[in-house]
């Protein structure tokens, strides 16, 4: 299940991955040295019955329909890390692999 | 980040894991031999700013606030399998470990 990829011109209403650039400087996150910007992507769209479901559980909860369950929502189902250079609180430059920074795939869960 | 656990008596409004029993017979899924029922759990509740976020990405998308992003939603962040006995489409009895059947933890993503 590879998920759907869309862009700002897409007419897709279902759960889809869209491009999004995160600009650390625009956030005022000046402790990040590299990258200054990166391609993060995000998930948006509707989760119709049985569409792009990551887990069997999602379908089962829809069937059981418990109190307070809002139905599945369009959310990252595969994430990847990026490598970063940044300052720590001791003002040392740190190299690190930061998990959960890029959305590789979206689905309904 | 261990997530919150709630029950039907909880007054918690934030993202939480609730107990849910899935009953295959009640669904009419008569090809499942065992278990007939299992404790699946489900996720429900509100995702306030920075609460129970699984990924740094979730916070970054909230900051960037792109068109069509609905904000994070309460969804499974850790799942586990269950072992099952069931009939396949050739009417053979299969034993298998089925992934994504139990919610171990909920979070906002």
């Amino acid at each position: 299940n590879l998920g759907l990829d869309c862009d700002e011109h897409s007419s897709e209403s279902r759960c889809c991955r869209y491009p999004l650039t995160v600009d650390f400087e625009a956030f005022g996150w000046d402790w990040i040295i590299a990258p200054k910007r990166y391609k993060a992507n995000y998930c948006s769209g509707q989760c119709e019955y049985m569409f792009m479901q990551k887990y069997p559980h999602t379908h089962l909860v829809q069937q059981a329909n418990p109190r307070g369950s809002a139905g599945p929502c369009c959310t990252p189902t595969k994430m990847s890390p990026i490598n970063m250079l940044y300052f720590n609180d001791k003002q040392q430059i740190i190299y690190g692999k930061i998990p959960g920074m890029v959305v590789d795939r979206c689905g309904c869960s | 980040n261990l997530g919150l656990d709630c029950d039907e008596h909880s007054s918690e409004s934030r993202c939480c894991r609730y107990p849910l029993t899935v009953d295959f017979e009640a669904f009419g899924w008569d090809w499942i031999i065992a278990p007939k029922r299992y404790k699946a759990n489900y996720c429900s509740g509100q995702c306030e700013y920075m609460f129970m976020q699984k990924y740094p990405h979730t916070h970054l998308v909230q900051q960037a606030n792109p068109r069509g992003s609905a904000g994070p939603c309460c969804t499974p962040t850790k799942m586990s399998p269950i072992n099952m006995l069931y009939f396949n489409d050739k009417q053979q009895i299969i034993y298998g470990k089925i992934p994504g059947m139990v919610v171990d933890r909920c979070g906002c993503s």
Partner: antibody
Framework: QVQLVQSGAEVKKPGASVKVSCKAS????????MHWVRQAPGQGLEWMGI????????SYAQKFQGRVTMTRDTSTSTVYMELSSLRSEDTAVYYC??????????WGQGTLVTVSS | SYELTQPPSVSVSPGQTATITCSGH??????VSWYQQGSGQSPVLVIY???QRPSGIPGRFSGSNSGNTATLTISGTQAMDEADYFC????????FGGGTKVTVLG
């Protein structure tokens, strides 16, 4: 305007060390990181490391760790790159480059370091 | 470690379009910059963030990036564009391609 002026060419023997300087002008020295990049004759560009002129903290490319030291002198708005245990493969033009929001900009004029016995 | 691969040379007639490629694994997921280096000169940034031109860079320079390949395009190439061009991306370090020598014929 922003300018980076580097020290002159050097000839060194294998095993020796070299210290290249890069004097910045036309901007607030402590507000921008500085990179060092080298280019062997007829070859591509190779990133060596970065220094924060404000606090002096550094990060070096794995290849150069243990052999390179980057320092700065805020009183003269100068950064330095020292490379030790020189070998013939270190013969290259060494550049300093300011870390701008959009990339390495501008670059110094380069310093040729020749390692020869 | 991450690698960027460029063709060693590209030839183009004056006024024609020069296309320089830079390939790397899932390069489209990263932002790519391009540097121009004239003979005996220091590098100059001509494209950043795949497609953006710094101020002072002529409009004939453009960039794109998708899949495994980033491309620098010089439209209406002039004699002054004869230089080496290097692509660059951030992975676990600042990585440069090997460079492409653009020769303007005639």
């Amino acid at each position: 305007q922003v300018q980076l002026v580097q020290s002159g060419a050097e000839v060194k023997k294998p095993g020796a060390s070299v210290k290249v300087s890069c004097k910045a002008s036309g901007y607030t020295f402590t507000s921008y990181y500085m990179h060092w990049v080298r280019q062997a004759p007829g070859q591509g560009l190779e990133w060596m490391g970065i220094i924060n002129p404000s606090g002096g903290s550094t990060s070096y490319a794995q290849k150069f760790q243990g052999r390179v030291t980057m320092t700065r002198d805020t009183s003269t708005s100068t950064v330095y790159m020292e490379l030790s245990s020189l070998r013939s493969e270190d013969t290259a033009v060494y550049y300093c480059a300011r870390d701008e929001n959009w990339g390495f900009d501008p670059w110094g004029q380069g310093t040729l370091v020749t390692v020869s016995s | 470690s991450y690698e960027l691969t460029q063709p060693p040379s590209v030839s183009v007639s004056p006024g024609q379009t020069a296309t320089i490629t830079c390939s790397g694994h899932a390069l489209g997921d990263k932002f790519v910059s391009w540097y121009q280096q004239g003979s005996g000169q220091s590098p100059v940034l001509v494209i950043y963030d795949d497609t953006q031109r710094p101020s002072g860079i002529p409009g004939r320079f453009s960039g794109s990036n998708s899949g495994n390949t980033a491309t620098l395009t010089i439209s209406g190439t002039q004699a002054m564009d004869e230089a080496d061009y290097f692509c660059q991306a951030w992975d676990s370090s600042f990585v440069f391609g090997g460079g492409t020598k653009v020769t303007v014929l005639g």
